[in-house]
Interface confidence: low
Amino acid sequence: KKVVLGKKGDTVELTCNASQKKSTQFHWKNSNQIKILGNQGSFLTKGPSKLSDRADSRKSLWDQGCFSMIIKNLKIEDSETYICEVEDKKEEVELLVFGLTANSDTHLLEGQSLTLTLESPPGTSPSVKCRSPRGKNIQGGRTLSVPQLERQDSGTWTCNVSQDQKTVEFKIDIVVLAFQKASSTVYKKEGEQVEFSFPLAFTLEKLTGSGELWWQAERASSSKSWITFDLKNKEVSVKWVTQDPKLQMGKKLPLHLTLPQALPQYAGSGNLTLALEAKTGKLHQEVNLVVMRATQFQENLTCEVWGPTSPKLTLSLKLENKKATVSKQAKVVWVLNPEAGMWQCLLSDSGQVLLESNIKVVPWPTPVQP
């Protein structure tokens, strides 16, 4: 007996071939011997089966001795043995219809769990193997669970359902609702304008919700809310904004904030949260601001950074086109009695410059010896 696997809602073609390549009489029946379809001469006839309105045959192939039965919009209950009677033989085909669906919405927040449920005919023991867009393989039986979705899990999940050494493939599109980055750091010289961007890792036709940016300045003992906003059909409207700093927010996606100038008192880290309508939980993105200041005070040239920097970052002071005079894995460096000229303060990570500030050193009059 031939086994054919089908997908719920899909179309399947059960083949049946006569030994002679010519049109002859045939019938398709179910296991209860109820006629589904057949022919009378060149006409397709249908029987009293519940399948009849969804069953068809390729009349164009009858002359070649091919008497297939096509079943549209498959249902799990269509799983049974079908019999093709042609010439003096009976061909049995066992059709097994499976359905694989996501238990919840296919739009899930990062960190939420995805459950896939397999619908299968009674008496079968299929195995399911799914591959996520990032290459992780999971396997199971009637249910498959992915406990904590990451943004890289967005995309098409390919699942293979196997039974009796046959396989049917399902593709399920999952959208993980998250920001493109979990965290980002902006490096700025003191006084420069700061742009914070929070691009989303998904697109939805209607995007509605509300959000807030909380900020923990390095110099402050507690965090405070900087801005709250609403999102209606991808339009952003500010509800409330702090007066220090005077933040501005873009009216369109991606979410965009502008800080008029980077100052040491603003250096720190923020957490932007976005609550989407009809979704439990919130999307988060961390943003860090690192501010650099280079100053000359009398015979002392100082470079300082504020904000969340890794201990691996190196701060250097160097005279233009010369080797660094001082380098340190610290947040402040200085040079005493610097030579006159253009000095550079560099914040770097393994040789890659993250932030640079130039300062012109003017000669400091040396005190006259008595």
Epitope: R134, G135, N137, Q139, G141, E150, Q152
Partner: antibody, heavy 118, light 111 residues
């Protein structure tokens, strides 16, 4: 055909770090998880962690958390495993392995012997 | 972590005879009708080679004298007729729960 080629043997002093590479070829590098498994002399096999070359995300065995870092370079189809604060008991052959479905290891590198000795 | 215990530690079998290796998991490695147990062969100086996956499935290219059985916590690898090239260390490994864990190994020799 699928190949995983690892870097050569290393001798390190206690407290130092070692970085072992695993260059993949013969398949789409970003599509398969790579695990690292080690084997001390005359001992059994121990899973250290895995990396998803597509995203760079990695998951570590709790035993090695804080000491192991797994990274990848998609431009060269290479995965790296760095183990820090080495001690004599870290002397082992370190294997990279490509996972099949779930955590079963179908393709293996040839192994890299790391010796930690003062 | 799931602890895997193999027995015996070593095994000497005559050529053409049957070799049986046992593996016990500290908790069930079954999930929804499948047993997440794999078996590997390792020869000196070589990496392990996958023989059996999900308890009883033979990996492509592996001779059919190798077979796996068992469920729950108790599993067996059988070599129906030992050949000279089967001399090696054999490891069981569970893949149900992270971290994946291996048995201590069973050394198979010719008597």
């Amino acid at each position: 055909q699928v190949q995983l080629v690892q870097s050569g043997a290393e001798v390190k002093k206690p407290g130092a770090s070692v970085k072992v590479s695993c260059k993949a070829s013969g398949y789409t590098f970003t599509a398969y998880v790579i695990s690292w498994v080690r084997q001390a002399p005359g001992q059994g096999l121990e899973w250290m962690g895995e990396i998803y070359p597509g995203s760079g995300s990695s998951y570590y065995n709790e035993k090695f958390k804080g000491r192991v870092t797994m990274t990848r370079d998609t431009s060269t189809s290479t995965v790296y495993m760095e183990l820090s604060s080495l001690r004599s008991e870290d002397t082992a052959v370190y294997y990279c392995a490509r996972s099949g479905d779930g955590s079963r290891f179908v393709y293996w590198g040839q192994g890299t012997l790391v010796t930690v000795s003062s | 972590d799931i602890v895997m215990t193999q027995s015996p530690d070593s095994l000497a079998v005559s050529l053409g005879e049957r070799a049986t290796i046992n593996c016990k998991a500290s908790q069930s490695v079954d999930y929804d009708g499948d047993s997440y147990m794999n078996w590997y062969q390792q020869k000196p100086g070589q990496p392990p080679k996958l023989l059996i996956y999900v308890a009883s499935n033979l990996e492509s290219g592996v001779p059919d004298r190798f077979s796996g059985s068992g469920s729950g916590t108790d599993f067996t690898l059988t070599i129906s007729s030992l050949q000279a090239e089967d001399v090696a260390v054999y490891y069981c490994q569970q893949s149900l729960q992270d971290p994946p864990t291996f048995g201590g190994g069973t050394k198979v020799e010719i008597k």
